[in-house]
Interface confidence: low
């Protein structure tokens, strides 16, 4: 069988994964025998995942491979020293193959000390008798979230059912900040309220502004380091006033001659709301009107007395026609007919003068 090497040191640059022959770091693996079935290349059951250092807290990278006679990390093309690995090995009961797992700890200082354009990275290398397998590179980055938003939402006054766009570009950060929106301190869930939509670039759209959307809106950016709130944008949904229908025309205000009639309407259909405009135009309309003046009735002159009749009376009359009452004017007051006793003419009896007898007409 061939000789295979495994690596125990961190002092070597390693681009081909073979390392240098150095007794301090390597020892020979046992030879395989021709009768043994061929061992497969190592397969990673778990590969290291990207990690973020928050404040000064170190991160752990972890991987697991089978079959693996040895397993080590290298970071930024340099092997991590054996003493910095925590290794565990067991035999998989089903396959009978050796499973090895390993973890290392990366500190903030180690990441900060790396110079060059590339981010700090680590990868796992596992050996079996068939050769070596490399895991993917896992990048380790120092997490942060800047304090200043690149764009903050601005307050708006919008009319009912208008579309509203509130813009937000979160502060720069690693990992990239997630964005959520608050409406009066409550998280907006567009799945729950379909009138809200959050765009891929973090802007909030209110599709059709409702009165209940009058509120304070805040953009919230958060990642594993921190949570930042934008300035609050107040959205006011206003309603412009609308006129009610006109009332009926009033009666003419003049009892005689020229006057006017009026009708009114109010700005209540709807009334303006949340700073909406009051109705434009007149709330009162007037038109000229003429009412015929009333004419009070007046009497004509009395007629001449009639001749003295057989009943020893004679009479005279007058008419309410000088002028007659018109347009609701007052009727004449007083007697239409007047009679009194007489003794001349055809009268057969002499009678003393008596009081006048008044006959009233209607």
């Amino acid at each position: 069988g061939s000789h295979h090497h495994h690596h125990h040191g961190s002092d070597y640059k390693d681009d081909d994964d073979k390392g240098s022959q150095d007794d301090e770091f390597f020892h020979e693996l046992p030879e395989t025998f021709p009768s043994d079935p061929p061992e497969p290349l190592p397969h990673f059951l778990i590969e290291p995942e990207e990690a973020y250092i928050v404040k000064n807290k170190p991160v752990n990278l972890y991987c697991k491979a089978s079959p693996a006679t040895q397993i080590y990390f290298k970071c930024n093309s340099e092997w991590v020293h054996q003493k910095d690995h925590v290794v565990d090995e067991r035999v998989d009961e089903t396959s009978g193959l050796i499973v090895r797992e390993v973890s290392i700890e990366i500190s903030r200082q180690q990441v900060e000390e790396l110079f060059g354009p590339e981010d700090y990275w680590c990868q796992c290398v596992a050996w079996s008798s068939a050769g070596t397998t490399k895991s993917r590179k896992a990048y380790v980055r120092i997490a942060y979230l800047r304090k200043t938003f690149e764009q903050e939402p601005l307050g708006k006054e919008v009319s009912l059912e208008q579309e509203v766009l509130l813009q937000c570009r979160p502060p720069e950060g690693i990992p990239v900040a997630e964005v959520e929106w608050l409406k009066n301190e409550d998280i907006i869930d567009p799945a729950e309220d379909r009138n809200f939509y959050i765009t891929i670039d973090h802007n909030l759209i209110i599709k059709q502004a409702r009165l209940s959307d009058t509120a304070n809106y805040t953009c919230v950016a958060k990642n594993i380091v921190a949570k930042r709130k934008s300035t609050t944008a107040t959205v006011i949904v206003y309603v412009n006033g609308g006129w009610s229908t006109w009332t009926e025309w009033s009666v003419c205000n003049s009892r005689c001659g020229r006057g006017y009639q009026k009708r009114t309407r109010t700005c209540t259909n709807p009334a303006p709301l949340n700073g909406g405009a009051f109705c434009e135009g007149q709330s009162v309309q007037k038109i000229a009107c003429t009412t015929l003046c009333p004419v009070d009735g007046r009497w004509t002159s009395w007629s001449k007395w009639s001749t003295c009749g057989t009943e020893c009376t004679h009479w005279r009359r007058r008419e309410c026609t000088a002028p007659a009452p018109k347009n609701g004017g007052k009727d004449c007051d007083g007697l239409v007919l007047q009679s009194k006793n007489c003794t001349d003419g055809l009268c057969m009896q002499a009678a003393p003068d008596s009081d006048d007898v008044a006959l009233y007409g209607s």
């Epitope: 409702r210 009165l211 209940s212 209540t268 709807p270 009334a271």
Partner: antibody, heavy 119, light 107 residues
Framework: QVQLQESGPGLVKPSETLSLTCTVS????????WSWIRQPPGKGLEWIGY???????NYNPSLKSRVTISVDTSKNHFSLKLSSVTAADTAVYYC?????????????WGQGTLVTVSS | DIQMTQSPSSLSASVGDRVTITCRAS??????LNWYQQKPGKAPKLLIY???SLQSGVPSRFSGSGSGTDFTLTISSLQPEDFATYYC?????????FGGGTKVEIK
């Protein structure tokens, strides 16, 4: 003529949930904003919140964490739930109709129902 | 929240008197103010909306005026049935808020 009628228990134990229903008769529950307003004994009026038949709600921030108003247009009624009540929630609870647009005046009111919070 | 302050908190008047109640908002509310009358054991009744519009069925002796922060409810000639508590309410923004009330009593 539109009429509103509150119904629900008159006595609720502290820490429990107060539940009231307002039944609207003589008119549709659509197109208005239906509010709950309360008045502690001998005190002034406090607006609790409103709901539109579309489900849009707006609650008084001082009560928001405890209030839920819901509407059932098929039954022409709307409901109030106020959780974790204390003696300070003892009041006459009114339901009212907000005419026209959301916060316009309350032109129809229920007669009110007294809810006492006591163990 | 917009605070509504009513004054006086109570007043005594006689039938036939002219009565004026004022309401002040903590910020400008344009004309979004409503007035209600409440009698003991009864629900409030809308009198005036949008500061000066008389609600249908309310006697014309009630009138409202004002804009911005200062508002007035006037009863031109107090009638026996007008003895009650009167509340103003702003409808400019939520939460909707009421004044503390003005009790009109018989002198």
């Amino acid at each position: 003529q539109v009429q509103l009628q509150e119904s629900g228990p008159g006595l609720v134990k502290p820490s429990e949930t107060l539940s009231l229903t307002c039944t609207v008769s003589g008119g549709s529950i659509s197109s208005y904003f239906w509010s709950w307003i309360r008045q502690p004994p001998g005190k002034g009026l406090e607006w609790i919140g409103y709901i539109h038949n579309s489900g849009t709600t707006n609650y008084n921030p001082s009560l928001k964490s405890r209030v839920t108003i819901s509407v059932d247009t098929s039954k022409n009624h709307f409901s109030l739930k106020l959780s974790s009540v204390t003696a300070a929630d003892t009041a006459v609870y009114y339901c009212a109709r907000g005419r026209g647009m959301a916060t316009l005046p309350f032109d129809y009111w229920g007669q009110g129902t007294l809810v006492t919070v006591s163990s | 929240d917009i605070q509504m302050t009513q004054s006086p908190s109570s007043l005594s008047a006689s039938v036939g008197d002219r009565v004026t109640i004022t309401c002040r908002a903590s910020q400008s509310i344009s004309s979004y103010l409503n007035w209600y009358q409440q009698k003991p054991g009864k629900a409030p009744k809308l009198l005036i909306y949008a500061a000066s519009s008389l609600q249908s069925g309310v006697p014309s002796r009630f009138s409202g005026s004002g804009s911005g922060t200062d508002f007035t409810l006037t009863i031109s000639s107090l009638q026996p049935e007008d003895f009650a508590t009167y509340y103003c309410q702003q409808s400019y923004s939520t939460p909707l808020t009421f004044g503390g009330g003005t009790k009109v009593e018989i002198k």
